[in-house]
């Protein structure tokens, strides 16, 4: 199809080489109130279309995205770029930053219901650049946390080095929906609830003498509880002795509860004490068996192929640790009578 009638939007993605960040393009097809665009090539101002333009009666998930190769080849279906670029509803997600994402992206309705819809398309020219270190040393992260129940704020990474006074007007989106009341480079949240979690996008316009660009950044906002003040506790084993049968295989499970920590480095391991000696045992990987907002339960098993007489003289110790401290629970094996 002919893309010369598409409206054009220029976007700039300045990515940090330090962090793993993503980027999005929205298919900003004209809405009924902007219908002059879809119809501008077809109708004089006096003519009235017999139906609303495409976007008037359909939802935005029904769009098709294309990539325009720089060498002038025909348009390519964006699905060819899977899994580096993924379409979800009207949004195109770029999973890996890089200048190779620079180029032209076109979106248009999947269903062309009338001749008027042919020109209903948007061409987005995306320029991708690595961030220069000099531009801002303390720019806001693309992953930000909000503490549940407290006040907090979400900063636009590309503007976080500017004061509120000198900051341009910002357009914010949350999970693809426009947040019409927010216009500053920072969203202030009076009290943080779980629903504040989501993918936020901030846009502002940057102009030079030749043209203007929309500078865009994506922020993943997580709602979290405060870091735990407690060391982990061992839920199992509870008893310090365990009845066993000699010659039989045995699995002893250690289950521990770790409170939430932003930087989470849980330790759970088994070691054996035999008189004055003690050594760590190589056991299967630990696994998370339950995860909630406040804590996580992690399990690690020690497996004995068969219980020997020597095992009865040993102590099997489960050791768990977080940044606050550690806890141990030892188990002595006792022959079943």
């Amino acid at each position: 199809f002919n893309i010369s009638g598409c409206s054009t939007k220029k976007l700039l993605w300045t990515y940090s080489t330090r962090s793993e960040e993503e980027f999005v393009l929205f298919c900003d097809l004209p809405e009924p109130q902007k219908s002059h665009f879809c119809h501008r090539n077809r109708l004089s101002p006096k003519q009235v279309p017999e139906h609303l333009p495409f976007m008037g009666s359909n939802d935005l998930s029904d769009v098709q995205w294309y990539q325009q190769p720089s060498n002038g080849d025909p348009l390519e279906d964006i699905r060819k770029s899977y899994p580096h670029i993924i379409q979800d509803k009207c949004t195109l997600h770029f999973l890996t930053p890089g200048v190779n994402n620079s180029g032209s992206y076109i979106c248009r309705p999947k269903m062309i219901k009338s001749p008027y819809d042919v020109a209903c398309c948007v061409k987005m020219i995306l320029e991708v650049k690595p961030q220069t270190n000099a531009s801002c040393e303390y720019s806001a992260s693309h992953k930000q946390d909000l503490l549940l129940g407290s006040t907090g704020s979400i900063s636009c990474p590309s503007l976080s080095c500017q004061s509120d006074a000198q900051s341009p007007a910002v357009t914010w989106y949350k999970n693809g929906k426009l947040l019409s009341v927010e216009r500053s480079n920072r969203i202030v949240v009076d009290e943080v609830y779980d629903y504040h979690q989501g993918t936020y996008v901030c846009d502002y316009t940057q102009s030079d003498t030749v043209s203007s660009w929309t500078v865009r950044a994506v922020v993943q906002v997580r709602t979290i509880v405060g870091d735990t003040k407690l060391k982990p506790d061992i839920l199992d084993p509870v008893e310090d002795t365990l009845e066993v049968e000699l010659g039989k295989p045995l699995t002893i499970s250690c289950k521990a509860r770790f409170g939430f920590e932003r930087v989470f480095n849980p330790v759970i391991k088994w070691y054996i004490k035999d008189s004055d000696l003690e050594w760590e045992v190589s056991v299967p990987e630990a696994k998370s068996i339950k995860s909630t907002l406040k804590d996580e339960i992690i399990e690690r098993n020690i497996i004995l192929e068969k219980v020997t007489q020597r095992d009865l003289r040993r102590k099997f110790v489960c050791f768990v640790q977080n940044s606050i401290g550690n806890t141990t629970q030892s188990v002595q094996l006792k022959e079943k009578r």
């Epitope: 993503e22 998930s61 993924i86 979800d88 509803k89 997600h93 999970n175 979690q197 993918t199 993943q220």
Partner: nanobody
Framework: QLQLVESGGGLVQAGGSLRLSCAAS?????????MGWYRQAPGKQRELVAS???????NYVDSVKGRATISRDNAKKTVYLQMNSLKPEDTAVYYC??????????LGQGTLVTVSS
């Protein structure tokens, strides 16, 4: 923290079918994410096999197109992968994960799928 738990793996004969399930622990996170199924065959890199957006749009890697169907149930916080006409080269550990969203990079423990010829 987001926990993802897969199930449904196992041993199946070539030409057979399997349905993998993945349950997430938090709904507020789940519904706005692009969820996906990854797989890792022995000695190979992990690859994204299929993904599904919050609006239901799906994508598949070429090797499973026409044989795999990914679906989701936001109310149950669950994502599924139906695999038909299985081939020995589909043998791998299959992981459910967040492809796009707040917990991007979160993966489950994995479920082993073995296809015997």
């Amino acid at each position: 923290q987001l926990q993802l738990v897969e199930s449904g793996g196992g041993l199946v004969q070539a030409g057979g079918s399997l349905r993998l399930s993945c349950a997430a622990s938090r709904s507020i996170t789940f519904s706005h994410n692009v969820m996906g199924w990854y797989r890792q065959a022995p000695g190979k890199q992990r690859e994204l096999v299929a993904s599904i957006g919050s609006g239901g749009s799906t994508n598949y890697v070429d090797s499973v197109k026409g044989r795999a169907t990914i679906s989701r149930d936001n109310a149950k916080k669950t994502v599924y992968l139906q695999m038909n006409s299985l081939k020995p080269e589909d043998t791998a550990v299959y992981y459910c994960g967040v492809v796009v969203g707040v917990y991007r990079g979160s993966l489950g423990q994995g479920t082993l799928v073995t296809v015997s010829s």
